[in-house]
């Protein structure tokens, strides 16, 4: 029961086009050490949405300060949502490895659906 869980509380989120979407994710433990990443889709063809460790993701902001000591909240907000952003988003914890980090555990996934922009 003490093993880390990746908690994605919402099964679905619906957002109007042009708005921002908040995708919630939290860890129940700081161990193991390693980054978290957000992906759209699962399996080999999944698309990287955010990498805590590196990269430039101009539309993504973190809801809390990820560098803050003992932070367990890895929720993100994606700005200017379009219909192309629809899909299932997974918050994934990686274990620090050498040379590469290893996937440790994934959240259950949050389906993002996009509504037409209100006229």
């Amino acid at each position: 029961e003490d093993e880390l869980q990746v908690i994605q509380p919402e099964k679905s989120v619906s957002v109007a086009a042009g708005e921002s979407a908040t995708l919630r994710c939290a860890m129940t433990s700081l161990i193991p050490v390693g980054p978290i990443m957000w992906f759209r889709g699962a399996g080999a063809g999944r698309e990287l949405i955010y990498n805590q460790k590196e990269g430039h993701f101009p539309r993504v902001t973190t809801v809390s300060e990820l560098t803050k000591r003992n932070n367990l909240d890895f929720s993100i907000s994606i700005s200017n949502i379009t219909p192309a952003d629809a899909g299932t988003y997974y918050c994934v914890k990686f274990r620090k490895g050498s040379p590469d980090d290893v996937e440790f555990k994934s959240g259950a996934g949050t389906e993002l659906s996009v509504r037409a922009k209100p006229s």
Partner: antibody, heavy 123, light 112 residues
Framework: QVQLVQSGAEVKKPGSSVKVSCKAS????????ISWVRQAPGQGLEWMGS????????NYAQKFQGRVTITADESTSTAYMELSSLRSEDTAVYYC????????????????WGRGTLVTVSS | DIVMTQSPLSLPVTPGEPASISCRSS???????????LDWYLQKPGQSPQLLIF???NRASGVPDRFSGSGSGTDFTLKISRVEAEDVGVYYC?????????FGGGTKVEIK
């Protein structure tokens, strides 16, 4: 053996508030969500809202929005449900229920229920 | 809100005979992660509800194997292969696919 221990029965006047507690005895909340479900006499089950202590925020059924507040104290493994502006139709047994988190399925079911707290609203 | 419709409302049963309860949802309960967010609970007289079946077809810990759940999407069934006297009470289906969580109206199972 973890149990959800609820506070005792209450009799309240219309217009007043009631606060019911639910303590996880023999365990912690960790990754659980706690929901509140009520049952009016002879009626079915009605979900009121839930809280995930790790996030600290609650979500509520539209019907109760603005009248119910669900909170949790992780240090004592206790959840609370406060219902305000009570009316006779709020007379019911109020249950707390625990939803475990499955790593691949998320929150999907209530595996443990409290014994219920009867709240009677009467003038 | 997702509306849950159970049938029948009342089910008189003979011990040793099978029984079946149907539950329909107004929207699909199947998530893209492959899970059906449909659970079955039994509330025995004077008691709290207890979990029987979760995520469509998984028997909860301690639940006898005479109980089984099946279905996907919008149509689900709870089956009791051989009813016992201790199975009397009100059976509820519940969806946790969307918010708010909603319950069926209940099926009262009683011995003939």
């Amino acid at each position: 053996q973890v149990q959800l221990v609820q506070s005792g029965a209450e009799v309240k006047k219309p217009g007043s508030s009631v606060k019911v507690s639910c303590k996880a005895s023999g365990g912690t909340f960790s990754s659980y969500a706690i929901s509140w479900v009520r049952q009016a006499p002879g009626q079915g089950l009605e979900w009121m809202g839930s809280i995930i202590p790790i996030f600290g925020t609650a979500n509520y059924a539209q019907k109760f929005q603005g009248r119910v507040t669900i909170t949790a104290d992780e240090s004592t493994s206790t959840a609370y449900m406060e219902l305000s502006s009570l009316r006779s139709e709020d007379t019911a047994v109020y249950y707390c229920a625990r939803a475990p988190y499955g790593s691949s399925s998320g929150y999907g079911y209530f595996d443990l229920w409290g014994r219920g707290t009867l709240v009677t609203v009467s003038s | 809100d997702i509306v849950m419709t159970q049938s029948p409302l009342s089910l008189p049963v003979t011990p040793g005979e099978p029984a079946s309860i149907s539950c329909r949802s107004s929207q699909s309960l199947l998530h893209s992660n492959g899970y059906n967010y449909l659970d079955w609970y039994l509330q025995k007289p004077g008691q709290s509800p207890q979990l029987l079946i979760f995520l469509g077809s998984n028997r909860a810990s301690g639940v006898p194997d005479r109980f089984s759940g099946s279905g996907s999407g919008t149509d689900f069934t709870l089956k009791i292969s051989r009813v016992e006297a201790e199975d009397v009470g009100v059976y509820y289906c519940m969806q946790a696919r969307g918010s708010p969580i909603t319950f069926g109206g209940g099926t009262k199972v009683e011995i003939k």
